[in-house]
């Protein structure tokens, strides 16, 4: 059975539907069972903090990135680390906290409509989940200029949020990552916690917009940990 929460990344003011589902023989669908969806009860609470091992940034929360815990440390041992705030040093976009991106080695605000007018950007990109390339090093990829004539609209396939138009972020939608709207005040968000069981979120939501954070909805404080509803709220 699909032992997960079937919620989507579309922005809704209602809680995601709970419960499992399965594609049984003879039913009308062919299902992909057992995939970890966001918002489920498989995350540990922050009190049970454990360094979460990872292979890529995507396996970490929105406020985290995947890296070796020590500078020049064993590349084979990577964990989810807290994202870098504005003006902190970085090597790639994922290291910077939501709402920021990495420019010239420093996390800067993405409100400045970066990349507009820039025809090409050279990025460091690694292949696959194992971060390996044919020669064992990250390769430098120059993105073709056509990608930057127009920024991706909602639904456009992307690799990073900088591929998307203003007000959109790049979030997984199973087959690929696509541009989705950044969440507004009152909209349901996914509170990323350490994963208790390994699995990718295949239907991700964007992060909350500027000035908002993902917090437990006030009238849900009494609910059990697993069913607490998080919404984007003013700081």
């Amino acid at each position: 059975t699909l032992n997960s929460v079937l919620n989507s990344n579309a922005i809704k003011n209602l809680p995601p539907p709970l419960g499992g589902a399965a594609g049984h023989p003879g039913s009308a669908v062919s299902a992909a069972p057992g995939i970890l969806y966001p918002g489920g009860n498989k995350y540990q609470t922050i009190d049970n903090y454990q360094p979460y091992p990872c292979a890529e940034d995507e396996e970490c929360g929105t406020d985290e990135y995947c890296a070796s815990p020590t500078r020049g440390g064993d590349a084979g041992v990577q964990i989810c680390l807290a994202c870098r705030k504005r003006r902190k040093r970085c090597m790639r976009h994922a290291m910077c906290c939501p709402g920021n991106y990495c420019k010239n080695g420093i996390c800067v605000s993405s409100d400045q409509n970066h990349f507009r007018g820039e025809i090409e950007e050279t990025i460091t990109e690694s292949f696959g989940n194992d971060h390996s390339t044919l020669d064992g090093y990250s390769r430098r990829t120059t993105l073709s200029s056509k990608m930057y004539h127009t920024k991706g609209q909602e639904g456009s396939v992307c690799l990073r949020s900088s591929d998307c138009a203003s007000g959109l972020c790049c979030a997984r939608h199973f087959w690929s990552k696509i541009c989705k709207p950044v969440l507004k005040e009152g909209q349901v968000c996914t509170k990323h916690r350490r994963k208790g069981s390994h699995g990718l979120e295949i239907f991700q939501r964007c992060y909350c917009g500027e000035g908002l954070s993902c917090r437990i909805q006030k009238d849900h404080h009494q609910a059990s940990n697993s069913s607490r509803l998080h919404t984007c709220q003013r700081h």
Epitope: A10, P17, V29, S30, N129, G155, R172, W175, S176
Partner: antibody, heavy 112, light 111 residues
């Protein structure tokens, strides 16, 4: 339980149009995209395009751009794929997919 | 010319290990787009075997594994069983076509 139930098999003449439906249930229809994929007898899978169930925005594979129209009716949680100017090599099984769930397929036969 | 190329057929005896390759280019697999693998039994819809390069849905035996490196991906089936006889397809996205693409498909025969 998530279900994608497709309409029944169709037999069409060359030059005609066919409209295949895909009724979704068990989830919030407007939260997901519906893709259409076809498979000619003995051949591989071929992506035709998608529709955003909420906005109705569509993206079509270039091959089908001039002949395909994808639409949806949110009130009945149903997606539609219409293919016009049918030719014999459009004979195929047409699947709708929510990416993680697939319909069972609709067989469309084009024959004079 | 197919975008994602797979061997048209592979075969193996029960218990053996087989590998199915999926070769793409710098505009699909090599551009860091994810690869998914499907199994299709005759007359049925495709069934997801591996998602996002190397993740296995529950219900899929751990005999199936996926990997991705450079411009290609592989599906490995260890300990072949008779019920594995089916067609297998890889899938990714291609930014030059602005389209999702499937591999040419591989027919697996269990001898």
């Amino acid at each position: 339980e998530v279900q994608l139930v497709q309409s029944g098999a169709e037999v069409k003449k060359p030059g005609a149009s066919v409209k295949v439906s895909c009724k979704a249930s068990g989830y919030t229809f407007t939260d997901y995209y519906i893709h259409w994929v076809r498979q000619a007898p003995g051949q591989g899978l071929e992506w035709m395009g998608w529709i955003h169930s909420n906005s109705g925005a569509t993206t079509y594979a270039q091959k089908f751009q001039a002949r395909v129209t994808m639409s949806r009716d949110t009130s009945s949680s149903t997606a539609y794929m219409e293919l016009s100017r049918l030719e014999s090599d459009d004979t195929a099984m047409y699947f709708c997919s929510r990416e993680d769930y697939w319909g069972k397929g609709t067989m469309v036969t084009v024959s004079s | 010319q197919a975008v994602l190329t797979q061997p048209s057929s592979v075969s193996g005896a029960p218990g053996q290990r087989v590998s199915i390759s999926c070769t793409g280019s710098s505009s699909n697999i090599g551009a860091a787009y994810d690869v998914h693998w499907y199994q299709q039994l005759p007359g049925t819809a495709p069934r997801l075997l591996i998602y996002v390069n190397n993740n296995r849905p529950s219900g899929v035996p751990d005999r199936f594994s996926g990997s991705k490196s450079g411009t290609s991906a592989s599906l490995v089936i260890a300990g072949l069983q008779a019920e594995d006889e089916a067609d297998y397809y890889c899938q990714s996205y291609d930014n030059s076509l602005n389209a999702y693409v499937f591999g040419t498909g591989t027919k697996l025969t269990v001898l």
